[in-house]
C-alpha cells in the first residue's frame, strides 16, 4: 500500500482543516488508514483522524482544531496499521479556504431597491471576521445569459442594487461567497442560493425619462 498523491490540506481558519490524498489502489480509508496530527506547541496532544473514502482510491480527513493562530504548524503522519506511509506538516494560515457565508436574504420591501444581506461565517474573536470581502452572484432562472457578479469590497455583509437593473416580472436567484486578502485565501464555497420574484413599477414620468436617458447612451 502506497500514497500516490500526498495529502494536501485547507483550513477554515477556525476549527476544521480538510486533508485529501490518493492511494495507489482502491482503499477502504476508514478501516485501513489513520491520519495523526499534532500542533507543534507545548502541551499539545496528538489527535487521530479517521478518513473517509473520496472515490475509489481517494481519502479525505477532517481535522478538528480548538482554535488557530497565524503561526500554527501541525505535524501530519499517515499510518496504515503499524506502517508509516507519509510524514508531513501543515500551516493552516498558509492554506485558508473561508467558511461560506450564511442566511442570505433578499429584502424587496423598498420598491426601487433590492437589499441583500447575509451573515459573516466567523465569530468576532476570529481574525477573519474583520477581513472578509464577498462576491454576490445573481442570475435569472429564465435566461442563462442574465448572470452577474457584484464584488463587495467593504466589510458590511450587505449589497444594495436598484431593482431596475434586473428585469421585471421574472424570478432571480442569488448566492454569496467570501475570501480574505490578508491570508491570500481561496474563495469559500457558495452559500445556498435564495430565490425571489423581481417586480417593480416605475411612475410614468420616471419611466419616460428613463427611456429617454437610455436612448442617449
Amino acid at each position: 500500500m502506497k500514497v500516490l498523491q500526498e495529502p494536501t490540506c485547507v483550513s477554515d481558519y477556525m476549527s476544521i482543516s480538510t486533508c485529501e490524498w490518493k492511494m495507489n489502489g482502491p482503499t477502504n480509508c476508514s478501516t485501513e488508514l489513520r491520519l495523526l496530527y499534532q500542533l507543534v506547541f507545548l502541551l499539545s496532544e496528538a489527535h487521530t483522524c479517521i478518513p473517509e473514502n473520496n472515490g475509489g482510491a481517494g481519502c479525505v480527513c477532517h481535522l478538528l482544531m480548538d482554535d488557530v493562530v497565524s503561526a500554527d504548524n501541525y505535524t501530519l503522519d499517515l499510518w496504515a496499521g503499524q506502517q508509516l506511509l507519509w510524514k508531513g506538516s501543515f500551516k493552516p494560515s498558509e492554506h485558508v479556504k473561508p467558511r461560506a457565508p450564511g442566511n442570505l436574504t433578499v429584502h424587496t420591501n423598498v420598491s426601487d431597491t433590492l437589499l441583500l444581506t447575509w451573515s459573516n461565517p466567523y465569530p468576532p474573536d476570529n481574525y477573519l471576521y474583520n477581513h472578509l470581502t464577498y462576491a454576490v452572484n445573481i442570475w435569472s432562472e429564465n435566461d442563462p445569459a442574465d448572470f452577474r457578479i457584484y464584488n463587495v469590497t467593504y466589510l458590511e455583509p450587505s449589497l444594495r442594487i436598484a431593482a431596475s437593473t434586473l428585469k421585471s416580472g421574472i424570478s432571480y436567484r442569488a448566492r454569496v461567497r467570501a475570501w480574505a486578502q490578508c491570508y491570500n485565501t481561496t474563495w469559500s464555497e457558495w452559500s445556498p442560493s435564495t430565490k425571489w420574484h423581481n417586480s417593480y413599477r416605475e411612475p410614468f414620468e420616471q419611466h419616460h425619462h428613463h427611456h429617454h436617458h437610455h436612448h442617449h447612451h
Epitope: 476549527s15 476544521i16 507545548l42 502541551l43 480548538d66 493562530v69 497565524s70 465569530p123 468576532p124 474583520n130
Partner: antibody, heavy 116, light 112 residues
C-alpha cells in the same frame, strides 16, 4: 520551564498612563493568544482582552475598550498592556495569561495603585 | 454579555468530604465550532489562578483525579470527591466560547 514574568508594581496619579509588560520564556508568544485579566482588591477575575501577537489582532471587553491597549513584540517575546486616564477604580492586580486554547500559564500579576 | 453565575458563593467542608460548585451561564456557551469552552480555575491564597478543568470535563495535567467537571448547555458542575486542606481558595468558572469571555463571581472554599 514555561514562565510569564510581569513588570513590577506601579503607583500612579489619577489621569496618568501606565504600561505593564509580560515577558514569556519557554515558549514563543506567536504560538498563543495573550490575554489580560483584571482583579480588583478582594474581587473576582475580569477578562479584559487579548492579542494574536503575530498579526496584532486585538479584541477587548467593551468595558475596557478605550481604557486598555494591548500590544506585543514578538522579537522580545513580550506582551504589553497600557492603561490610560487612570482612576481609583483601575487599582487592581493585572494578570497576563497565555491561552492555547485555555489559560494554562499565568503571570504573577502586577499591582497598579491609582492614588492622588 | 454572557453572565456566569456560581453557587454557592462560599463553602465550608470537612477534610475528606465531597464538595460541589454549580455554574450557570445566561445563554448557551457552545462555540460556533461545536466545542464548549467551559473551564474551572482555582486561585489559592496569594497566588495566581491555576487551571483545573477545560472543555467541561477534561482535567488539566497534574490536577488530582478527585476533581471532576460535568454539565452541558448552560449548567455545569465542579465536584471534589474528597476535599483536602490544599484545596482551599476561590474557584472560578469561565466561558471562552463567546466574546467577551467571562468569569463567574467565584466560590470560596474553606476547610472546617
Amino acid at each position: 520551564e514555561v514562565q510569564l514574568v510581569q513588570s513590577g508594581a506601579e503607583v500612579k496619579k489619577p489621569g496618568a498612563t501606565v504600561k505593564i509588560s509580560c515577558k514569556a520564556s519557554g515558549f514563543n508568544i506567536k504560538d498563543t493568544y495573550m490575554h489580560w485579566v483584571k482583579q480588583a482588591p478582594g474581587k473576582g477575575l475580569e477578562w479584559m482582552g487579548r492579542i494574536d501577537p503575530t498579526n496584532g489582532y486585538t479584541i477587548y471587553a467593551s468595558k475596557f475598550q478605550g481604557k486598555a491597549t494591548i500590544t506585543a513584540d514578538t522579537s522580545s517575546n513580550t506582551a504589553y498592556m497600557e492603561l490610560s486616564s487612570l482612576r481609583s477604580e483601575d487599582t487592581a492586580v493585572y494578570h497576563c495569561v497565555s491561552r492555547r486554547p485555555w489559560f494554562a500559564y499565568w503571570g504573577q500579576g502586577t499591582l497598579v495603585t491609582v492614588s492622588s | 454579555d454572557i453572565v456566569m453565575t456560581q453557587t454557592p458563593l462560599s463553602l465550608s467542608v470537612t477534610p475528606g468530604q465531597p464538595a460541589s460548585i454549580s455554574c450557570r451561564s445566561s445563554q448557551s456557551i457552545v462555540h460556533s465550532n461545536g466545542n464548549t469552552y467551559l473551564e474551572w480555575y482555582l486561585q489559592k491564597p496569594g497566588q495566581s489562578p491555576q487551571l483545573l478543568i477545560y472543555k467541561v470535563t477534561n482535567r488539566f495535567s497534574g490536577v488530582p483525579d478527585r476533581f471532576s467537571g460535568s454539565g452541558s448547555g448552560t449548567d455545569f458542575t465542579l465536584k471534589i470527591s474528597r476535599v483536602e486542606a490544599e484545596d482551599v481558595g476561590v474557584y472560578y468558572c469561565f466561558q471562552g466560547s463567546h466574546v467577551p469571555y467571562t468569569f463567574g463571581q467565584g466560590t470560596k472554599l474553606e476547610i472546617k
